[in-house]
Every structure is written in C-alpha cells, then in structure tokens.
Amino acid sequence: IPAPSIRLVPPYPSSQEDPIHIACMAPGNFPGANFTLYRGGQVVQLLQAPTDQRGVTFNLSGGSSKAPGGPFHCQYGVLGELNQSQLSDLSEPVNVSFPVPTW
C-alpha cells in the first residue's frame, strides 16, 4: 500500500535540545491507521490516527535528536481483508538540521 507523506512542522528546532514535531499522513482512503515513526531504522514512537483522520503529528521531546542518528521515516499499517495487518511502504526520509551557531 502507498507510502505516507512526511514533513517537519513548526515550531522548528533550533538546537538539539528542542522538541521535534513531525507530521505523517496516509493517502485519502486510509483513515484511522496506526503510524510508526523510525529514526535510523529504530522505532521512535507509535500513534494511531483518529478514526476519521489520515494522519498524526509526532512530538519528540528535546534531546531525542541525539541518538540514534539518521533521517526520520514513517510507516502506517491498516487492517486488510481477513483482519490481516498490511504495512505501507516507508515514507521519504526527513532530515533534521540545526542552524549553525554564530559566535
């Protein structure tokens, strides 16, 4: 099933201590899906979308950007025929970068 879209949403982090907010959204015909956010291939957070919505927004508290490294991806799962769970393709990656400090 098709991959979700992924985007960084404000407030954008300005340092590694700031929270990171990431929105993931499934295509139109998959409301209420279960979403998984990955970083560097490891599960960061799991959320279920409201039954009438196609997406969720993840809040990663400050400091969670330190480890593991690598880009963020998300994926969603839905119950298909015979109540079998079907997983989407992984989203495109999202990289979180911080402004270079000016001294």
Partner: antibody, heavy 120, light 110 residues
Framework: QVQLVESGGGVVQPGRSLRLSCAAS????????MHWVRQAPGKGLEWVAV????????YYADSVKGRFTISRDNSKNTLYLQMNSLRAEDTAVYYC?????????????WGQGTLVTVSS | QSVLTQPPSVSGAPGQRVTISCIGS?????????VHWYRQLPGTAPKLLIY???NRPSGVPDRFSASKSGISASLAITGLQAEDEADYYC??????????FGGGTQLTVL
C-alpha cells in the same frame, strides 16, 4: 471509542481555587497531547492550555498564565486543570480535548464540558 | 480580542456558496502553523471540520473546503443547506506555542 468526561465544575467565589478533572478512555492516553479549551456564556472558544503526552511540556494562554496549572496522571488516564485566584472572567464551560497526535496539531476529540461559575 | 480575526457573521441562501476568512499574523498562520476549522452547534461541543489546512475528516461532505495562504486562511461552503447553520471557528498556534482561536463566525442560512 474515545471518551472524555470532565468533572469538578461548579460555583466558586472570586479569589478561590478549583480543580477540574478529565477521565479519558478508549485510547492510549499516555500517547497523546491534551488540551483545555473554554467558552464563556454566549462567547467564542478560548484555548487555555496544552500538555504534551509525557507531561514534559506545558503551555498556557496569557490570560491564565501563573494562575492555572495543567497536569496529567498517565497511570490514571486523567487530565487536570488546577485553577487558582479565580476571577469573574474565568466563568465558562471548560472542555477537555485530545490532540490528534503526541504533538499539538488539531483537536480531534472533545468532552462535553463542565461549567465553572465564578461569582460572589 | 481574538488573535485570529474572523467575520462575526455571514449568511447565504440555500444552494449558495459562502466563505469565512481567518486572518492571523506572521507569528501564527504566517509562521507555518497549520490551520484547523471547527463547527459548533448550539449547546454542543465543537467538532473538527477541516484539519491541517485543507483536509476533511471522513464523514465531512466535500461541500466543505479550505485553503491557506500567507497569514490567512479561508473556509468555503458550497451548496448551502439549512443544517449548515452553526458557529465556525478557525484555530492555529502561535510562536510562543499557545493555541489561538478565531472569534467565531455565525453562519445563517436565509
């Protein structure tokens, strides 16, 4: 299904305190950001406060900052609003509401509200 | 005084199209925060109508649509029906991370 049930409203004198509670069920409470929104009689919606899924971040409207405290007990699936130094202008229906995710985003689910009346 | 500005009332005849504007500033809508729309019937809790600027929850008719540009957003309702009479609110966030609502717009179907 998602259920949010507010309690603790009532009549209170100016300057006194009140604590509202919101019992949540039908979802994994500890995964979602939660809000309080209020509505004065005959007026519009006013956002009051939000707390992150783990309680680590809290933000308030300027009108209640320093007087109201939002908190949560994830082991009890309960959201709280401690209201101190109440004023007549705090009179409103207070709604407990759930965000669509662990971040603020949209308010996907609302309780039915509890009425707080501040009057001498 | 609400942070987001909406017209207090709009009206239209059945079948017509109406729009409700929501004007913010560079610290909220203009800063990239998403805009959400809620509908409230008298004596009931608000209900989500549009989320993340343009998306309809399932069950909301496609007569309802929304857009966002710069510091403002708007909600459009086509094919107006008597049951559309309600109060409509836009909502976003501010750069201090507090939520902000519009003052609400009362829609009257003539």
């Amino acid at each position: 299904q998602v259920q949010l049930v507010e309690s603790g409203g009532g009549v209170v004198q100016p300057g006194r305190s009140l604590r509202l509670s919101c019992a949540a069920s039908g979802f994994t409470f500890s995964s979602y950001a939660m809000h309080w929104v209020r509505q004065a009689p005959g007026k519009g919606l006013e956002w009051v406060a939000v707390i992150s899924y783990d309680g680590s971040n809290k933000y308030y409207a300027d009108s209640v900052k320093g007087r109201f405290t939002i908190s949560r007990d994830n082991s009890k699936n309960t959201l709280y609003l401690q209201m101190n130094s109440l004023r007549a202008e705090d009179t409103a229906v207070y709604y407990c509401a759930r965000s669509s995710g662990s971040s603020w985003s949209n308010i996907a689910y609302w309780g039915q509200g509890t009425l707080v009346t501040v009057s001498s | 005084q609400s942070v987001l500005t909406q017209p207090p009332s709009v009206s239209g005849a059945p079948g017509q199209r109406v729009t409700i504007s929501c004007i913010g500033s560079s610290s909220n809508i203009g800063a990239g925060y998403d805009v959400h729309w809620y509908r409230q019937l008298p004596g009931t809790a608000p209900k989500l109508l549009i989320y993340d600027n343009t998306n309809r929850p399932s069950g909301v008719p496609d007569r309802f649509s929304a857009s966002k540009s710069g510091i403002s957003a708007s909600l459009a309702i086509t094919g107006l029906q008597a049951e559309d009479e309600a109060d409509y609110y836009c909502q976003s966030y501010d750069s201090n991370l507090s939520g902000v609502f519009g003052g609400g717009t009362q829609l009257t179907v003539l």
